[in-house]
């Protein structure tokens, strides 16, 4: 694949009602099974079809799960994660990191390569600055008329 | 559904090398945990070496040093390069595909399992 691979990183609280087979997606990570090399988040690996996640469409996969219930999911072990899960009760509210890739070349999936990504911030800067200077430079251009 | 086909068995001296192939069809998903199992006679099965479609590696103690695991995520391949390989290397390998823990009713893994093919030490 050519070209700087960047993810352009968005935060989300989901609020999913649990359905008759559960949440509806899997799960991946954790310290003893680390999903991404130096990362011990945990990350959806699947989201099954007719599932609550997927009739509620935003969870999608690659997407890093924060926090359960406002539970921290940071430096815990697999099964420790999902026994969150499993206690989370009926309602459960997800604090969820989604990934879009932004690169020059072809688009693989996501889920692969550097988690970080980068800060939203770090795209709408530039975004504005040259925005700004656009405008500048016409105001200056009717200015000459 | 799920298929893995291995390959790369075989019989091979003290020393030497082998390399295990495993090819998965289906729908198997971007994100998932790809890796190898062994299981001698009368033992349970055990993980040999893994490896994560986001690049993370896990290996067994006593193939550390010995067998690399890679996979081509175009091919939806897994690959275990043994070298230095002993006699108590000798066993059947599996391969198997992992998509995670299922948050559902049962909360189990979302697993599949090759045939398997045998190595041989001698």
């Known amino acids: 694949m050519n070209g700087r691979v960047d993810y352009l990183v968005t935060e989300e609280e989901i609020n999913l009602t649990r359905g008759p087979s559960g949440l509806g997606f899997n799960i991946v990570g954790g310290t003893d099974q680390q999903y991404v090399s130096n990362d011990s988040g945990i990350y959806v690996s699947r989201i099954k079809e007719n599932g609550a996640a997927a009739l509620d469409g935003r969870l999608q996969e690659g997407d890093k799960i924060l926090s359960v219930n406002g539970q921290d999911l940071k430096n815990l072990l697999h099964q420790d994660a999902v026994d969150l899960f499993r206690n989370a009760g009926y309602a459960v509210s997800l604090r969820v990191q989604h990934r879009l890739q932004v690169q020059n070349g072809p688009i693989g999936h996501r889920g692969e390569g550097d988690p970080s990504g980068i800060p939203i911030f770090m795209v709408l800067v530039p975004v504005f600055a040259l925005t700004m200077v656009a405008a500048w430079a016409f105001m200056r251009y009717r200015q000459q008329l | 559904q799920v298929q893995l086909v291995e390959s790369g068995g075989g019989l091979v001296q003290a020393g030497g090398s082998l390399r295990l192939s495993c090819a998965a069809s289906?729908?198997?998903?971007?994100?998932?945990?790809m890796g190898w199992y062994r299981q001698a006679p009368g033992k349970q099965r055990e993980l040999v070496a893994s490896?994560?479609?986001?690049?993370?590696?896990n290996y067994a103690d006593s193939v550390k040093g010995r067998f690399t695991i890679s996979r081509d995520n175009a091919k939806n391949a897994v690959y275990l390069q043994m070298n230095s390989l002993k006699p108590e290397d000798t066993t059947v390998y599996y391969c198997n595909l992992d998509r995670g823990t299922h948050l559902g009713d049962s909360f189990e893994r979302d697993d599949y399992w090759g045939r398997g093919t045998q190595v041989t030490v001698s």
């Open positions: 490896i994560t479609s986001g690049g993370a590696t």
């Open positions: 289906g729908s198997i998903g971007s994100i998932n945990i």
